[in-house]
Interface confidence: medium
């Protein structure tokens, strides 16, 4: 059998084996050692007994999408049946005081590989036995502590494979410079040691994406906006746009990144090198927000122009740094360009990312202020509580709801929350009456809300003892 017979041939992209070599990977046309690494089809009954106490689940994740040329990292984590874990020596042990369906285990080990390897090898002391090899026959690398690594991971993508000895968690990084744009499939098969052979315990696959677009995400925040995820914002208040570029391998670390904004409100283009920008819409309506991100990234060199007929001696080729635009897929696309092969040449290519959103601008409550507080004197004094009127003004749209949150002086421990509908005239002047239990200092958060906005003001107040002569004080506004 060959690797591609064992590892599956599912192909999300039409091109495959004619692929550029991934660095350190091997062709899946190579032979697979089925004696050491048995191959079981899906549904084979042997899977049921491949692991003591249940099935092992492999979870494969990646930091996809990857900008072409950057590194993409894949991580595989093994999840063992309940009450099982890997110890410091790489053995699989039962967790102390953990009860599974079989109850508490008397034997601390699920798999004691240390004991196996000590009495199984007969190896001439080098560790180079015929069974310490990968499925293609390559010997295991003898890093310090390699004997504690009891899982063999075989990664397979793009008609190539990569073998790795590891513990219950491994990571593999792949450079995407030679990978065709679009979705690709990564498949991983995991084996465990079993005496002098190996047993398959899990198979997993995941899609990853290679793109020539800079992956761009934009978060939008506006003070007083009630729901930040509905793309509805308020007129006359700045919106903060924050651009996050997904670049986990730091491919663009040394690139100058330019952000070109069009807010769709006839304010023109705004170009910045800062990933955050504030913009205030002064009209209601629906606007098309467009962002283009541009970065000069390391990339393939364009083909050189045809050389002129030399009339003079040609100067020697120095190391060059070139830059050119790419709006269409370049060498990583489906029709690879012939690349120039100038030694040590260091070219750059302008990569772009785009973000577009339709945002709705509406009236909202822009500001709220407490302009006066009055202690309400009651005919019969209540020994334990005070009634206080807050006179509140607001700007913007008319609120439909008022909430007061009364808490301790640090504003952290809430003591009382009261919300009530309000009917306010266009002057937006209202009185909110609240009860305070006993004297002391209180933090008061007062919010006015409508369907789209929520405006807040806070104040610290000192409520005196029930001595009518004691004035009410606003401690801090």
């Amino acid at each position: 059998k060959r690797f591609h017979d064992v590892l599956g041939n599912e192909r999300p992209s039409a091109y495959m084996r004619e692929h550029n070599q991934l660095n350190g990977w091997s062709s899946d046309e190579n032979d697979w050692n089925e004696k050491l690494y048995p191959v079981w089809k899906r549904g084979d009954m042997r899977w049921k007994n491949s692991w003591k106490g249940g099935r092992v689940q492999a979870v494969l994740t990646s930091d996809s999408p990857a900008l072409v040329g950057s590194n993409i990292t894949f991580a595989v984590n093994l999840i063992f049946p309940r009450c099982q874990k890997e110890d410091a020596n790489g053995n699989i042990v039962y967790e102390k005081n953990c009860r599974n369906e079989a109850g508490l285990s008397a034997d601390p080990y699920v798999y004691n590989w240390t004991a196996w390897s000590e009495d199984s090898d007969g190896e001439n002391g080098t560790g180079q036995s015929h069974h310490n090899v990968f499925p293609d026959g390559k010997p295991f690398p003898h890093h310090p502590g390699w004997r504690r690594w009891n899982f063999i991971y075989v990664f397979h993508t793009l008609g190539q494979y990569f073998q790795k000895l590891g513990r219950c968690s491994v990571r593999v990084s792949v450079n995407t410079a030679n990978v065709t744009l679009g979705p690709q499939l990564m498949e991983v098969t995991v084996y465990r040691r079993h005496g002098r052979a190996y047993v398959p315990i899990a198979q997993v696959k995941d899609v990853y994406v290679v793109t020539d677009q800079i992956p761009v995400f934009v978060t939008m925040f506006q003070k007083n906006d009630r729901n930040s995820s509905d793309e509805t914002f308020l007129k006359d208040l700045p919106i903060m746009f924050d651009v996050l570029i997904h670049d986990p391998s730091h491919f663009l670390n040394y690139s100058t990144i330019n952000y070109k904004w069009s807010f769709g409100d006839n304010t023109g283009l705004f170009v910045s090198t800062n990933h955050t920008v504030n913009h205030t819409y002064v009209l209601n309506g629906t606007f098309s927000l467009n962002l283009t991100v541009k970065a000069a990234a390391p990339g393939p060199c364009p083909p050189p122009p045809p050389p002129p007929r030399p009339s003079k001696p040609t100067p020697s080729l120095a190391t060059t740094l070139k830059s050119y635009d790419s709006n269409t897929p370049g060498p990583a696309g489906d029709n690879p360009l012939e690349l120039s092969r100038i030694p040590d040449e260091n070219c750059q290519i302008n990569r772009y990312g785009h973000f577009q959103a339709t945002i709705t601008i509406v009236e909202g409550i822009l500001e709220v202020n407490i302009i006066q507080m009055t202690d309400v004197l009651m005919p019969v004094p209540w020994p334990e509580s005070s009634l206080i009127d807050f006179v509140v003004t607001c700007q913007g749209s008319i609120p439909t709801e008022v909430c007061t949150i009364i808490s301790d002086p640090t504003c952290e421990i809430t003591q009382n929350t009261v919300c009530s509908p309000v009917d306010v005239d266009e002057m937006c002047l209202l009185t909110v009456r609240r009860t305070f239990n006993g004297s002391g200092t209180y933090c008061v958060n007062l919010t006015l809300g409508d369907d789209t906005s929520l405006a807040l003001t806070s104040t610290l107040i000192s409520v005196p003892d029930r001595d009518p002569a004691s004035p009410l004080r606003m401690a801090n506004s």
Epitope: L181, V207, D334, H354
Partner: antibody, heavy 119, light 108 residues
Framework: QVQLQESGPGLVKPSQTLSLTCTVS??????????WSWIRHHPGKGLEWIGY???????YSNPSLKSRVTISVDTSKNQFSLTLSSVTAADTAVYYC???????????WGQGTLVTVSS | EIVMTQSPATLSVSPGERATLSCRAS??????LVWYQQKPGQAPRLLIY???TRATGIPARFSGSGSGTEFTLTISSLQSEDFAVYYC??????????FGQGTKVEIK
């Protein structure tokens, strides 16, 4: 809100080529985590996935139709297109364009266009 | 390719009653399964993904369950707007993405 709209002739003669275009609005076709698919629904039968295209031009078609299917993309117009050659009466169906999310499922669909193959 | 089989082909239910639709895969698709609803003259609408997660805006009366080869879509109390055709689709092994042939939920 993303919207997709199919357009093209509703009647095609046998052995000719069916051509449809899907126009995407409310979102860019040049997005790295979406793929753009054609799916058809034969009268009285289930849905059949025809093929997809990625903004870069990478395509993949259902092996059952592969030799007859061509899918192309025009990012400047935010459109992608399907051509199906050598059609027969068995290709009579409602044709949908759809946005595929992360190579998993189809989260937005066009309204569909009925294509009848008849002489 | 993975073949998806839905049963029954037609389900007659009275409004307010519970409807249970079944979808079977010819081999395991883990939980990589979605359900769509399609009304006459309309495009399919995404209901459930990941076998059990409701899509945005889908009412709580729709629930999905199952893993491997057997899946169920349950509508706890049928409303008049729920009478439609329901399709399942796997996205575990692709391409191609494959769909069931549909279950029509009609008024009893």
């Amino acid at each position: 809100q993303v919207q997709l709209q199919e357009s093209g002739p509703g009647l095609v003669k046998p052995s000719q080529t069916l051509s449809l275009t899907c126009t995407v609005s409310g979102g860019s076709i040049s997005s790295f985590n979406y793929y753009w698919s054609w799916i058809r629904h034969h009268p009285g039968k289930g849905l059949e996935w025809i093929g997809y295209i990625y903004y870069s031009g990478s395509t993949y078609s259902n092996p059952s139709l592969k030799s007859r299917v061509t899918i192309s993309v025009d990012t400047s117009k935010n459109q992608f297109s399907l051509t199906l050659s050598s059609v027969t009466a068995a290709d009579t169906a409602v044709y949908y364009c759809a946005r595929g999310y992360n190579w998993n499922y189809f989260d937005y669909w066009g309204q569909g266009t009925l294509v009848t193959v008849s002489s | 390719e993975i073949v998806m089989t839905q049963s029954p082909a037609t389900l007659s239910v009275s409004p307010g009653e519970r409807a249970t639709l079944s979808c079977r895969a010819s081999q395991s698709v883990d939980n990589n399964l979605v359900w769509y609803q399609q009304k006459p003259g309309q495009a399919p609408r995404l209901l459930i993904y990941g076998a059990s997660t409701r899509a945005t805006g889908i009412p709580a009366r729709f629930s999905g369950s199952g893993s491997g080869t057997e899946f169920t879509l349950t509508i706890s109390s049928l409303q008049s707007e729920d009478f439609a055709v329901y399709y399942c689709q796997q996205y575990n092994n692709w391409p191609p993405w494959t769909f069931g042939q549909g279950t029509k939920v009609e008024i009893k």
